[in-house]
Interface confidence: low
Amino acid sequence: DPVLCFTQYEESSGKCKGLLGGGVSVKDCCLNTAYAYQERNGGLCQPCRSPRWSLWSTWAPCSVTCSEGSQLRYRRCVGWNGQCSERVALGTLEWQLQACEDKQCCPEMGGWSDWGPWEPCSVTCSKGMRTRRRACDHPAPKCGGHCPGEAQESEACDTQQVCPTHGAWAAWGPWSPCSGSCHGGPHEPKETRSRTCSAPEPSQKPPGKPCPGPAYEHRKCTGLPPCPVAGGWGPWGPVSPCPVTCGLGQTIERRTCNRPVPQHGGPSCAGDATRTHICNTAVPCPVDGEWDLWGQWSTCVRRNMKSISCEEIPGQQSRWRTCKGRKFDGHRCTGQQQDIRHCYSIQHCPLKGSWSEWSTWGLCMPPCGPNPTRARQRLCTPLLPKYPPTVSMVEGQGEKNVTFWGRPLPRCEELQGQKLVVEEKRPCLHVPACKDPEEEKL
């Protein structure tokens, strides 16, 4: 028959967990001995492992609630495909019985004593109630027992006396108008109301008590606006230190509108909260030095050689710059004053050349003169020799870039009768007049 197959058997509770599905045979379900099965929904859960005794169940409740009784527990032979031992089939129950005692003794009823005397009436005039009591001690109950019935009873009583009428206040009258129009001034405004001892008046015979408490009541008026307070200046504070260490600066004195602070619509302080003064350090400010532009590169030379021009011999050249404008202990210029590089000299060297493409059109010249024109050129550009682009001059200093230096003499085939530059000019069209932009604003 098909069963419900589960992926876990919970040993402690004997329950199947993790439903895998139904409609499978026990044999297929128990291909995995960790699985468990149920014959029908809610039926006994059996693990797929080889049969063995389950854990003992918890003890059943004691058969009686007081004095000695007994209680049972059981365990079951569970598993699949076998027996727990000889002659013990799957599903067999084994029982254990033990003595138990939830409570040593059983409760016993007690008995009441005789009723005690009636207590005095609960009131001294008109009608009230009186009470009498009895004790649960004839005999006393045992083992948590009790006496049947009530421990006290009550009945009505009449004092035959007329009660006095005590005074009670009538309702408060309305509040009087307020004694002022704002609060926070010298006299705090109040309102007052009164009441009469007439609801009812105290009786004469027998004499009743007068009304307790005051006949008048005062309170501060609420909802009034606060009285306005005009602001007043506090003293001038100290002059702040001169904020600069050279040249002119500005110091500030401050005062606060807090003696008193303006409140509740009162006017603020008139005048300024700050005043400034010029302070003079009489010390000129330092001026930092700034590098001027680099000078021209010197001729490309090599020590102990008269000329290296047009040779595949690397030389060196340098250029200099000056630190300008440093005054009054300003910062010196940072960086190097001299720049040195490696070079090949191609000064005045005859080199094969090629004509460049046309340059872009230049600016119109003259910009403000008559008939401005623009020009473009093609140049006879020298083809540089294929010398090594880097050299290693000193061991351990690595490779250094080498730059071509000098103005060579390029040789190109003649173009439009020219050997070095071919120029083309065009007039500029629709030229506007040059005007001072400041004059245009007027």
Partner: nanobody
């Protein structure tokens, strides 16, 4: 082989309802188990609800009392009715089928349908 196609996902306000449907085709006679799983961004895929061939159901604690799984063998569909939706139900919901045969089982998954619950 079994093919699964989900439908019914979408955007819904918190407290609203959606009904997801999964249509199975192919060798469906050997399916013993159908289930809905979900995967929120940055989280692992988790079981939402499953139903066996005999109709036994299991639900995740977080959806008990709000979601109901059912199957219609005539139409080869499994449905997840989702009520009282919460923002934390936002995820991609996947239909799953467990196929069981003598030689072993196989898992099949749908492409997923997005469910977004706005606060």
């Amino acid at each position: 082989q079994v093919q699964l196609v989900e439908s019914g996902g979408g955007l819904v306000q918190a407290g609203g309802s959606l009904r997801l449907s999964c249509a199975a085709s192919g060798r469906i006679s050997s399916i013993i188990h159908m289930a809905w799983y979900r995967q929120a961004p940055g989280k692992q895929r988790e079981l939402v609800a499953e139903i066996s061939r005999v109709g036994t159901t299991v639900y995740a604690d977080s959806v008990k009392g709000r979601f109901t799984i059912s199957r219609d063998d005539a139409k080869n569909t499994v449905t997840l009715q989702m009520n009282s939706l919460k923002p934390e139900d936002t995820a991609v919901y996947y239909c799953n089928a467990l196929q069981y045969e003598k030689h072993g089982g196989a898992d099949y998954w749908g492409q997923g349908t997005q469910v977004t619950v706005s606060g």
